[in-house]
């Protein structure tokens, strides 16, 4: 099925979803190692079988990842390689999602209740906004289809809503700084202790200085994952989640807490 989709000259949103599902065998939300090599092989075979040339995007993709076993791509990168229908592709090419900081600001706008989730209705509005910003309008049926597909693509724990880390897969892998924090997330108890101890003035939120101190310590403890030279970027991205410079417990938890105790 996925192979026949790869032969198409234009891939629909639902076909794109099937292709992704087929190659992301472990359901990690990324294609890496064997998964990525399988995709490249099948893509080359499919285009050859259909008598289609590789597009410039496909060519540079194969050049970049064909000979590497350390490659890793997300949904965004794949959407740029495959000839996907325009409106769906726009969701991955949105200006608001070009940088992590912009993404965080967008998240803050839609996660209005600071619940740490964007639910179906909020997601629909989010996608509608993205398309409108690109001067595109889609009918409600198409919008519902896109919303459903986005949930299917990103909702890795199948709870019918998107967490920040799930939604962040809309970002190119290189831009997705949240990935760096995945390996160093604290359990709920540790996170609460850190939040309390770094909230120097006890006002119930973390300000930029307190975040700076916390991040410097995290970089010191996790040199493999975090680079102290990138602290300004980390800080800027995380502060984009704040409410007028106030980073509340639930907001910081999105980045640093694994949730359980």
């Amino acid at each position: 099925m996925a192979e026949s989709h790869l032969q198409s000259s234009l891939i629909t949103a639902s076909q794109f979803f099937e292709i992704w599902l087929h190659f992301d065998a472990d359901g990690s939300g990324y294609l890496e190692g064997k998964e990525l090599q399988n995709l490249i092989q099948e893509l080359l075979q499919a285009r050859k079988k259909a008598g289609l040339e590789l597009s410039p995007e496909m060519k540079s993709f194969v050049d970049q990842y064909g000979q590497r076993d350390d490659g890793k791509i997300g949904i965004v990168e794949l959407a740029h390689v495959l000839p996907t229908e325009e409106n769906f592709l726009l969701l991955f090419r949105c200006q608001q999602l070009k940088s992590c900081e912009e993404f965080m600001k967008t998240w803050r706008k839609y996660d209005t209740d600071h619940s740490g989730f964007i639910e179906t209705e909020e997601l629909k509005n989010f996608l509608k906004d993205l398309l409108e910003k690109a001067n595109k309008t889609v009918d409600d049926t198409k919008l519902a289809e896109y919303t459903d597909l986005m949930l299917k693509l990103f909702d890795s724990n199948n709870d019918g809503k998107l967490e920040l880390t799930e939604m962040a897969r809309l970002l190119p892998v290189q831009e997705n700084f949240l990935l760096k924090f995945q390996g160093i997330k604290m359990c709920g108890k540790e996170f609460n202790k850190a939040f309390e101890l770094y909230d120097q003035d006890g006002n119930g939120y973390i300000d930029e200085n307190e975040l700076d101190a916390l991040l410097k310590d995290l970089c010191e403890k996790n040199k493999q994952e975090l680079d102290i030279n990138n602290i300004t970027t980390y800080k800027k991205n995380i502060m984009a989640l704040s409410d007028g410079g106030k980073l509340y417990r639930t907001d910081l938890a999105l980045i640093l807490s694994a949730g359980d105790n």
Partner: antibody, heavy 117, light 111 residues
Amino acid sequence: QGQMQQSGAELVKPGASVKLSCKTSGFTFSSSYISWLKQKPGQSLEWIAWIYAGTGDTNYNQKFTGKAQLTVDTSSSTAYMQFSSLTAEDSAIYYCARHKYRYLDYWGQGTTLTVSS
Amino acid sequence: DIVLTQSPASLPVSLGQRATISCRASKSVSTSGYSYMHWYQHKPGQPPKLLIYLASNLESGVPARFSGSGSGTDFTLNIHPVEEEDAATYYCQHTRELPWTFGGGTKLEIK
């Protein structure tokens, strides 16, 4: 183990200003807060203010706003407190102390300030 | 500002006995499962030394004869058994909110 070395005793005239220093070592200065505290003879301690060494941002006890001014020099890991418009009331021992979290774990040895004509 | 009242102001104790110092806050200094009360030992000519942080945690290098307890508004520092070198003034301090304040101090004397 962190260390904080404060400047020597000062004898100054009323109305003058004085700048006390606190040179630190043995811990990461840029992710620490440095607080300054006052102790008059036979009395308890009073928290004056803190400065976050990473950015130079400050937080003052209202009582000392306009009286104390805190700065840092990150290149030498040194914190400073300038005390202005001195009166006899300002005669005291002044301590600098570090807090990474919400308690003062390293202290300087103290600087005695005497304001007298 | 939160006012901390320490008692007694002076405490004569015999060697090997227990010394109990109390600190009462004018409002709760506990929140989110933490109590922002700390204890310091101060000897003449030396800087204060952190003994106990967050009500009951012993600072590293401090002998186990020192212990702290309490939550909300009432806190206690216990020293048992008291040794000669424990003669000093002890202060409680809160960091629940700004400004941070200290208790008036308790002078421990060895009888």
